[in-house]
């Protein structure tokens, strides 16, 4: 599985979208975890609602929010008020019982806000820049996921 690299600005929000095969992962909750070391365990940060039918509702743990569109096959994780300590390797997971299948590996990189180092008068920051979309950032090769659209007969 390829690793997607996403960059976000310190103090702002970073949105991560993990797509998956909606049919294959039918009925399964999703989770966002942080990998501890290269081969270490993945420590759960937040998971979707305990009732799968309510997975569309946002679940929060600290500054991390998760929500799942189970029909579109997209789980969205938002890292709010991004800090340098949030940088690292994460996983989107699909849960089945005690098992977890990795949907996507994500390397989060935190960029220092240039306003911290320079005079604010020298820079123009557009209003929309308060949130970074993962899709707007260059990343490695696309992940090997099935389409989430209806099956062919």
């Amino acid at each position: 599985l390829n690793t997607t690299v996403l960059q976000g600005m310190a103090g702002q929000s970073l949105r991560v979208s993990c797509t998956y095969d909606a049919l294959k992962h039918w009925g399964r909750r999703k989770a966002w975890c942080r990998q501890l070391g290269e081969e270490g365990p993945c420590q759960r940060v937040v998971s979707t609602h305990g009732v799968w039918l309510l997975a569309f509702l946002k679940k929060r743990n600290g500054s991390t929010v998760i929500a799942d569109d189970t029909l579109a096959g997209t789980v969205t994780i938002t890292l709010k008020n991004l800090q340098a300590g949030d940088a690292g390797l994460y996983q989107c997971q699909s849960l089945r019982g005690r098992e977890a299948e990795v949907l996507q590996k994500v390397l989060v990189e935190v960029l220092e806000d240039p306003l911290d180092d320079q005079d604010a008068g020298d820079l123009w920051v557009p209003e929309e820049s308060s949130s970074f979309e993962g899709a707007q950032v260059e990343h490695s090769t696309s992940r090997n996921q099935e389409t989430s659209f209806p099956p062919t007969s």
């Epitope: 049919l23 294959k24 039918l53 209806p150 099956p151």
Partner: antibody, heavy 119, light 106 residues
Framework: QVQLQESGPGLVKPSGTLSLTCAVS?????????WSWVRQPPGKGLEWIGE???????NYNPSLKSRVTISVDKSKNQFSLKLSSVTAADTAVYYC????????????WGQGTTVTVSS | DIQMTQSPSSLSASVGDRVTITCQAS??????LNWYQQKPGKAPKLLIY???NLATGVPSRFSGSGSGTDFTFTISSLQPEDIATYYC????????FGGGTKVEIK
Amino acid sequence: QVQLQESGPGLVKPSGTLSLTCAVSGGSISDSAWWSWVRQPPGKGLEWIGEIYHDADTNYNPSLKSRVTISVDKSKNQFSLKLSSVTAADTAVYYCARDTKYWGGMDVWGQGTTVTVSS
Amino acid sequence: DIQMTQSPSSLSASVGDRVTITCQASQDISNYLNWYQQKPGKAPKLLIYDASNLATGVPSRFSGSGSGTDFTFTISSLQPEDIATYYCQQYVEAPTFGGGTKVEIK
């Protein structure tokens, strides 16, 4: 269109293993679908046994999980059911079906095969 | 497991009658419910998926409605060829079927 055909022994001895195969024609087992097994004891209702995806991911009925194995053979475009430690209560018509869940339900079924458990 | 309770277990109606079958889920299943028709000695046939969508090739006299825990299946005008047993089925988790409703002609 996709068609399914079950095959396997019609008689299995108690404590033995029931083995059935479902051949998929008119389509590929790699199509986006869960390939399922459902059974129906004589004069009774339908009971879902389990299902398999083309990547060999499986889901089983919790009440049968310890005895059931479903596998897929992409090269032969078929999937199989094994049910171990059978008793007379496992006597039923066994159906294979294609399940696309929200995107169309169990829309394709085999004609069913009768399996009797008896010595 | 989600239990599906279907009623009645059997009914007798005249040709042209409106026939209604109900199905109740033991917990909220949204609209994730299908209806099947099974004639003696034959495999089940999908009639309605996602509670209210008519499957391909199914006559428009068949319809389904409901959401959450309570669902209804209707045959607007019973035909002789509709003699069969009808099953509801949920698929939120491990699929389970209702006990079936046997429909006969008076």
